[in-house]
């Protein structure tokens, strides 16, 4: 499964699209900043097995896809960029799923690290709660957009796990 190159390319494209989606300058939204506590320490201190890395990356992308597929998200972003971004995420999910099948076989279930999956879910719950509290304001979405860009760039350690042969 030659995922690292494909995934990095798609990840880069998704990041560019996410950057282009911005509507207000972050300079105008400094007061709305929020610490979402991306679980980078947990990821950094862990040597991921290939299947674990895939499942955690899958969860991150799935949660991002869900977040940007809501009605509130549709109202916040320019439609064509949002569609391109969602397509890029969908393709990444497909790539990861194909890789799982290749890595562990169709019959087997990948070794899921529940703690890491849970940490990712809680992180996205905090993001969703923040958006709700801020009533999905333009600046709240800007804060979230910047945060997702950061989390995408933080997932490098997970990609290192994808390069290793188990």
């Amino acid at each position: 499964c030659d995922l690292p190159q494909t995934h990095s390319l798609r990840n880069r494209r998704a990041l560019i699209l996410l950057a282009q989606m911005g509507r207000i300058s972050p300079f105008s939204c400094l007061k709305d900043r929020h610490e979402f506590r991306f679980p980078e320490e947990e990821f950094d201190g862990h040597q991921f097995q290939k299947t674990q890395a895939i499942s955690v990356l899958h969860e991150m992308i799935q949660q991002t896809f869900n977040l940007f597929s809501t009605e509130d998200s549709s109202a916040a972003w320019e439609q064509s960029l949002l569609e391109k971004f969602s397509t890029e995420l969908y393709q990444q999910l497909n790539d990861l799923e194909a890789c799982v099948i290749q890595e562990v076989g169709v019959e087997e279930t990948p070794l899921m690290n529940e703690d890491f999956i849970l940490a990712v879910r809680k992180y996205f719950q905090r993001i969703t709660l923040y958006l709700m509290e801020k009533k999905y304001s333009p600046c709240a979405w800007e804060v979230v957009r910047a945060e997702i860009m950061r989390s995408f760039s933080f997932s490098t350690n997970l990609k290192k796990g994808l390069r290793r042969k188990d």
Partner: antibody
Framework: QVQLVQSGAEVKKPGSSVKVSCKAS????????ISWVRQAPGQGLEWMGG????????NYAQKFQGRVTITADESTSTAYMELSSLRSEDTAVYYC??????????????WGQGTLVTVSS | DIQMTQSPSSLSASVGDRVTITCRAS??????LNWYQQKPGKAPKLLIY???SLQSGVPSRFSGSGSGTDFTLTISSLQPEDFATYYC?????????FGQGTKVEIK
Amino acid sequence: QVQLVQSGAEVKKPGSSVKVSCKASGGTFSSYAISWVRQAPGQGLEWMGGIIPIFGTANYAQKFQGRVTITADESTSTAYMELSSLRSEDTAVYYCARHLEYAFPDKFDYWGQGTLVTVSS
Amino acid sequence: DIQMTQSPSSLSASVGDRVTITCRASQSISSYLNWYQQKPGKAPKLLIYFASSLQSGVPSRFSGSGSGTDFTLTISSLQPEDFATYYCQQSYSTPLTFGQGTKVEIK
């Protein structure tokens, strides 16, 4: 590593304009913010405004609104600061400063070497 | 605009001394405060961000504390290379504003 290289010193007449450039290397130019900060001789630091190249539009401090224009050229990874209607009190060292990638533009992580602009008749 | 006031404006100290610089904001800025060091003829250098986080590569003798309106930069044991001017900067809202600076001189 990250580097910001600014254009050379300028001597200008009152009423004229000056355009200072800041060429960046390291990181993805379009996705981080660049601010301009000035320092008059023997004085403190003053934020003039900033830009995130991918947005195109800049934010300015009220004090400089209408007199300063901050732009960015993604093709050359260069940011520019143009100050018009120069007066003697605009004599200062002008710094470009880079904020962290994918982060809110709150702290100045990297600085250019500074450009001295002298306004004198 | 948020005004930042530093004190003292200058101080004299000896190598090995513990030095404390304070910074006060005209309104609450949470923990959105950064500290910079500037040497003559050089660009400022980030030391502390978000009130108390040490910037990578900065010696541990530098520390920051405070939240709301009152903040402190402490140099636990002053070294010869620490003689410089120090600035605080708020990043709570635009315009981003700096304190007037504190010059640390050799006694």
